[in-house]
Interface confidence: medium
């Protein structure tokens, strides 16, 4: 706001006022009269740039007159009082109310004094973020979706991710006239490494005190990725039983584990217990390749592991494997 004058009257008002769609807003406007100087205010007038006539007038003796009486009201101006406060309240803000307004004091003998105020009509958007569940497509696809609905002006959406990828943002008219819905997709090539990781959608809007952060946990459906653990190449005869574990990562979760060997069914010393294969002690050397076949809703994948049980004393009496 301008600094107080030393010898002249000054109309004080903010250069810009924000208001929310459907709400009411006050356009502040004050006359500052320095020192002992006297002024006669005969009229307060509000007009809109580009429109002929006044939208609100307050005469010193006739009181207020409004172009839209149900939507406008002088906040402080009253008959029989010094007209120093021309602040105007607007009700039921509409998109078309946005624009430049002039607050004018007709004073004597100083003359007319006015100031311009820019009214910004805002609409606070509603923000949502959701995962876009995908399979291994081998090409870039949307994995997360962030939507800012009914903002004015349009919200600004950015993404934060350690996974790579790129945004694809579009705009469409909102439900209320003059508002905008912004949709942003986070696009990348799906991989099993992406599944369960998160990306963050950041929505910025001038109606927010601070940006809104929405985290999305990604979902990538993929068939099992299988490996077998539990064998350390040092299994010997006469040791205790040992265990092989079929390690499977998949989404959705595995529905079944099937153990076999390259020769066919499991030998008597190998007992399948779901994802684990129990290897009982053997009395003669063996050289067997075990197969673990894991199934989920997207398919089956398998892993092989060759196990040798050798002669010779174990280094430790604890078992065929170090477990």
């Amino acid at each position: 706001w301008p600094p107080p004058g030393t010898g002249d009257i000054i109309v004080q008002a903010p250069t810009q006022v924000p208001g929310f769609l459907g709400d009411s807003v006050t356009l502040p406007c004050y006359l500052q009269v320095p020192g002992m100087e006297e002024t006669h205010v005969s009229q307060l007038t509000w007009s809109r740039h580009g429109e002929s006539g006044s939208m609100a007038v307050f005469h010193q003796t006739q009181g207020p007159n409004y172009s839209e009486p149900k939507r406008l009201e002088f906040v402080a101006a009253r008959l029989g009082t010094e007209l120093r406060d021309a602040s105007l309240r607007m009700f039921g803000l509409r998109v078309e109310d946005e624009g430049n307004y002039t607050c004018l004091f007709v004073t004597f003998p100083q003359g007319s004094r006015s100031v311009d105020i820019w009214l910004r009509v805002l609409a606070k958007p509603q923000n949502t973020a959701e995962v876009q569940k995908v399979q291994l497509t081998g090409k870039p696809v949307p994995v997360a979706r962030c939507v800012s609905t009914g903002g004015r002006p349009p919200a600004h959406i950015t993404w934060h991710s350690d996974l790579g990828g790129m945004p694809n943002t579009s705009q469409a008219p909102g439900f209320l006239s003059g508002t905008v819905t912004v949709t942003s997709l986070w696009i990348l090539v799906p991989s099993s490494q992406v599944d369960g990781k998160s990306v963050t959608c950041k929505v910025e809007h001038e109606s927010f005190e601070k940006p809104q952060l929405l985290t999305v946990n990604l979902t990538v459906y993929y068939p099992p990725e299988v490996s077998i653990s539990g064998y350390d190449n040092n299994w010997y005869l006469s040791q205790n039983e040992a265990t092989l574990t079929c390690d499977a990562r998949s989404n959705p979760e595995p529905t079944g584990y099937n153990w076999s060997t390259t020769m066919g069914p499991l030998p008597p010393f190998a007992v399948a217990q779901g994802a684990q294969l129990l290897i009982r002690p053997v009395d003669k050397p063996i050289n067997t390749t075990f197969i673990c076949n894991v199934t989920n809703a997207l398919g089956a994948r398998q892993a092989e592991l060759t196990v040798q049980v050798k002669e010779g004393p174990p280094s430790e009496p604890s078992g065929m494997s170090s477990n």
Epitope: S42, Q60, T61, Q110
Partner: antibody, heavy 121, light 110 residues
């Protein structure tokens, strides 16, 4: 064309009253400040009062409070000044003047030709 | 009531610059006095020249300018013309009323 057409000369007796008129045209009367001024022959000007035509709001030089009364009729865009209890001291030319605004200040913009009032028995 | 004093008469020549002043009995003239300057020519033809100390009225030649000089209001005519010969009145605003000066008779000698 902007005009301030004042009523004709008046010859009145002491103690009487007189009502001077100032019919305006060519501008928005209702948003005008109009002052009345007095000038005695060969002398300076004296400000009597102003009126804001839109509201009828007035402000008087204290010297003329009770002596002069200024009014307006917006329907005819006419300003009036009634002078009462006239004395020979009130003999003068009376001007109505519309104030114009430069935006930053008012000036004495449009002058009537003046009405000569002579107070004599 | 305040008294406003002007030079009773000044003489200048065409093309010269002349300054008319306006003093207040209450002290220094300030912008809060919103000095006005009015020209009167024969047959009571009045023209408002300046309002609000230094704001020239529309249509008034640029050679007329208003200002504050020291503690007085001033009307300066830069490059006076013969048609500028007239009586010039200043008027000062005192919170709620105007007070006119006695007027300055300006003669422009050929």
């Amino acid at each position: 064309q902007v005009q301030m057409q004042q009523s004709g000369a008046e010859l009145v007796k002491p103690g009487a009253s007189v009502k001077l008129s100032c019919k305006t045209s060519g501008f928005t009367f209702s948003s005008s400040y109009i002052s009345w001024l007095k000038q005695k022959p060969g002398q300076s000007l004296e400000w009597i009062a102003w009126i804001y035509a839109g509201t009828g709001d007035t402000n008087y030089n204290q010297k003329f409070t009770g002596k002069a009364q200024v009014t307006v009729d917006t329907s005819s865009s006419t300003a009036y000044m009634q002078f009462s209890s006239l004395t020979t001291e009130d003999s003068a030319i009376y001007y109505c003047v519309r104030h114009g605004s430069t935006g930053r200040g008012w000036y004495f913009a449009v002058w009537g030709a003046g009405t000569t009032v002579t107070v004599s028995s | 009531q305040a008294v406003v004093t002007q030079e009773s008469a000044l003489t200048t020549s065409p093309g010269e610059t002349v300054t008319l002043t306006c003093r207040s009995s209450t002290g220094a003239v300030t912008t809060s006095n919103y000095a006005n300057w009015v020209q009167e020519k024969p047959d009571h033809l009045f023209t408002g020249l300046i309002g609000g100390t230094n704001n020239r009225a529309p249509g008034v030649p640029a050679r007329f300018s208003g200002s504050l000089i020291g503690d007085k209001a001033a009307l300066t005519i830069t490059g006076a013309q013969t048609e500028d010969e007239a009586i010039y009145f200043c008027a000062l605003w005192y919170s709620n009323h105007f007070v006119f000066g006695g007027g300055t008779k300006l003669t422009v000698l050929q």
